[in-house]
Interface confidence: medium
């Protein structure tokens, strides 16, 4: 029979034949042959694999480093990674929670909608058209663009969400 060009779900193609993938929590030891099944082994104590796979090494569980203010929220299993969270009163800097801050700063282009409290982190909002923020800050709101007209000037460079407009003198040559 013709060798397969594609395999079923939870299988992979190798040496012109379809082998079973290893289930989550197990790694590949050896590919299947005409006569033998795929050989898989469970991941070790501090390791995991979270998908059907053909990986020869399991991934290490994430380390929740107390020096970064992290602690374990949910212990990893052979099929899931460890989930870290921050110590009481601290907040994750990202969804992956790789480090902690007392309160998060809003990046340039974003302003503070609500300053952090003891229990809630800073709430940031994108600066709308007509406003900008050029700093990373845990406190500053978006600032309105400078109004060139009120200074009897004209816009020389348009503003963005991260920069103010640049005003310049009116062109006196106009009739």
């Amino acid at each position: 029979p013709e060798p397969p060009t594609a395999c079923r779900e939870k299988q992979y193609l190798i040496n012109s034949q379809c082998c079973s993938l290893c289930q989550p929590g197990q790694k590949l030891v050896s590919d299947c042959t005409e006569f033998t099944e795929t050989e898989c082994l469970p991941c070790g104590e501090s390791e995991f694999l979270d998908t059907w796979n053909r990986e020869t090494h399991c991934h290490q569980h994430k380390y929740c480093d107390p020096n970064l203010g992290l602690r374990v929220q949910q212990k990893g299993t052979s099929e899931t990674d460890t989930i870290c969270t921050c110590e009481e009163g601290w907040h994750c800097t990202s969804e992956a929670c790789e480090s902690c801050v007392l309160h998060r700063s809003c990046s340039p282009g974003f302003g503070v909608k609500q300053i952090a409290t003891g229990v809630s982190d800073t709430i940031c909002e994108p600066c709308p058209v007509g406003f900008f923020s050029n700093v990373s800050s845990a406190f500053e709101k978006c600032h309105p663009w400078t109004s060139c007209e009120t200074k009897d000037l004209v816009v020389q460079q348009a503003g963005t969400n991260k920069t103010d407009v640049v005003c310049g003198p009116q062109d006196r040559l106009r009739a």
Epitope: E87, C100, L102, V135, S137, A138, E140
Partner: nanobody, 116 residues
């Protein structure tokens, strides 16, 4: 190397005043928002106050609003906290901080004790 050195703490009676200073070095001081944070005995860290890099905008925790004043002198790379009408609950180690990240740049702190 970034360094922050607080001073000005001490023992003061309720209702008294103190002025804390924080001498900064190793970074471009005026580029950064600076903060005061405190840790009361047996408690977690509490954010106290912050000031924008240019010194024009200031922010305070409700617990100190109207009593504490944050300021900075960018020509001297120094941050200040003027503390008036001190209360027993203001007793804490006060830290100045360049950033509020857990692992980032903090001073060693200065102890303020409010007691009669």
């Amino acid at each position: 190397e970034v360094q922050l050195l607080e001073s000005g703490g001490g023992l003061v009676q309720p209702g008294g005043s103190l002025r804390l200073s924080c001498a900064a070095s190793g970074f471009t001081f005026e580029w950064y928002e600076m903060q005061w944070v405190r840790r009361a005995p047996g408690k977690g860290l509490e954010w106290v106050s912050a000031i924008s890099g240019d010194g024009y905008r200031t922010y305070y925790a409700d617990s100190v609003k109207g009593r504490f004043t944050i300021s900075r002198d960018n020509s001297k790379n120094t941050l200040y906290l003027q503390m008036n009408s001190l209360r027993a609950e203001d007793t804490a180690v006060y830290y100045c901080a360049k950033e509020l990240a857990f692992f980032d740049y903090w001073g060693r702190g200065t102890l303020v004790t409010v007691s009669s």
